[in-house]
């Protein structure tokens, strides 16, 4: 998607690697379940998928903030400041309201990912079939 800033997506990727050091976020968490990846529908297939649904919902809330006016309505176009120490993520207090909100969405999702089991059977699901309302 041309509206997505590679730097912003990279931040989320690095945040996930902070809490799950051996992971390859784009490979493992893209097109997983019903919500990890572009869009989302139906009931999440597991806890990890639910993390992604919550992340999507968090971005939807961010879009409602007056301070969040995104290019192409996409939160990934906003970059933020954060630090990673060990496996602890801290969103910088220097972030403005919008950046702080998105940083927190990403931070919570990364932590959620780290606590959720990964089921290989849920990777590249047929969403038409398994992600129904």
């Amino acid at each position: 998607d041309s509206g997505i800033s590679p730097r912003a997506v990279w931040q989320f990727r690095k945040m996930i690697k902070c809490v799950i050091p051996g992971s390859d976020p784009f490979l493992e968490y893209n097109n997983y379940g019903c919500y990890c990846g572009l869009g989302g529908s139906g009931t999440p297939v597991d806890e990890l998928d639910k993390c992604c649904q919550t992340h999507d919902n968090c971005y939807d809330q961010a879009k409602k903030l007056d301070s969040c006016k995104f290019l192409l309505d996409n939160p990934y176009t906003h970059t933020y400041s954060y630090s990673c120490s060990g496996s602890a993520i801290t969103c910088s207090s220097k972030n403005k309201e919008c950046e702080a909100f998105i940083c927190n969405c990403d931070r919570n999702a990364a932590i959620c990912f780290s606590k959720a089991p990964y089921n290989k059977a849920h990777k590249n699901l047929d969403t038409k079939k398994y992600c129904q309302s």
């Epitope: 139906g42 009931t43 999440p44 297939v45 597991d46 806890e47 998928d49 639910k50 089921n119 059977a121 849920h122 038409k128 079939k129 398994y130 992600c131 129904q132 309302s133």
Partner: antibody, heavy 116, light 106 residues
Framework: EVKLQESGPELVKPGASVKISCKVS????????MNWVKQRPGKGLEWIGR????????NYNGKFKGKATLTADKSSSTAYMQLSSLTSEDSAVYFC?????????WGQGTLVTVSA | EIVLTQSPAITSASLGQRVTISCSAT?????VHWYQQKSGTSPKPWIY???RLASGVPARFSGSGSGTSYSLTISTMEAEDAAIYYC?????????FGAGTKLELK
């Protein structure tokens, strides 16, 4: 409007088989999972299994493997469940239910009575 | 397989009383759904994805919970709420129901 119309009541003898049907209307039959749920008189709900008419994929509750056989006919938008080697334990109301993770649409139920 | 245990099995409540029905899973589940069934009729979807009310369900109903513990609450009991309530969940791709809680009007 989504409708699931089940076949009428059945009185069958022990050891026999029965095939009940669920004809749907109001949606694309091939695109949604069809489940079957059992309810014995005065008892709770038991999930038997489900079929995806689009490709014939089936998930069974292990308890009903060998007892229930699920099929679907896309041309008539009808789902079927065959129950074999019937005993008094199989006397129940059987519901066809559309859904995957939860069940928004239910049929009216088919009463199957197993009696000599 | 996930086993869902509902409690109590039977309960009675007076008009206007607050009622809570519990559903406990043997292992953590992402979501629990609830159905209402009255005598001689098919179950009706009542609450889905923990707390979302199905179409036509009165606002006095609510759902909550996480992990292995979930509940359905009626803020003020009404006569029409007397029914059997079932919780349901799934562990991809298999489903299970609780045994049901019969709610009677006292």
């Amino acid at each position: 409007e989504v409708k699931l119309q089940e076949s009428g009541p059945e009185l069958v003898k022990p050891g026999a088989s029965v095939k009940i049907s669920c004809k749907v209307s109001g949606y694309a039959f091939s695109s949604f999972w069809m489940n079957w749920v059992k309810q014995r008189p005065g008892k709770g709900l038991e999930w038997i299994g489900r079929i995806y008419p689009g490709d014939g994929d089936i998930n069974y509750n292990g308890k009903f493997k060998g007892k229930a056989t699920l099929t679907a006919d896309k041309s008539s938008s009808t789902a079927y469940m065959q129950l074999s080697s019937l005993t008094s334990e199989d006397s129940a109301v059987y519901f066809c239910v559309r859904g995957w993770a939860w069940f928004p649409y239910w049929g009216q139920g088919t009463l199957v009575t197993v009696s000599a | 397989e996930i086993v869902l245990t509902q409690s109590p099995a039977i309960t009675s409540a007076s008009l206007g009383q607050r009622v809570t029905i519990s559903c406990s899973a043997t292992s953590s589940v992402s979501y629990v759904h609830w159905y209402q069934q009255k005598s001689g009729t098919s179950p009706k979807p009542w609450i889905y994805e923990i707390s979302r009310l199905a179409s036509g369900v009165p606002a006095r109903f609510s759902g909550s919970g996480s992990g292995t513990s979930y509940s359905l609450t009626i803020s003020t009991m009404e006569a029409e709420d007397a029914a059997i309530y079932y919780c349901q969940s799934w562990n991809f791709p298999l489903l299970s129901f609780g045994a049901g809680t019969k709610l009677e009007l006292k």
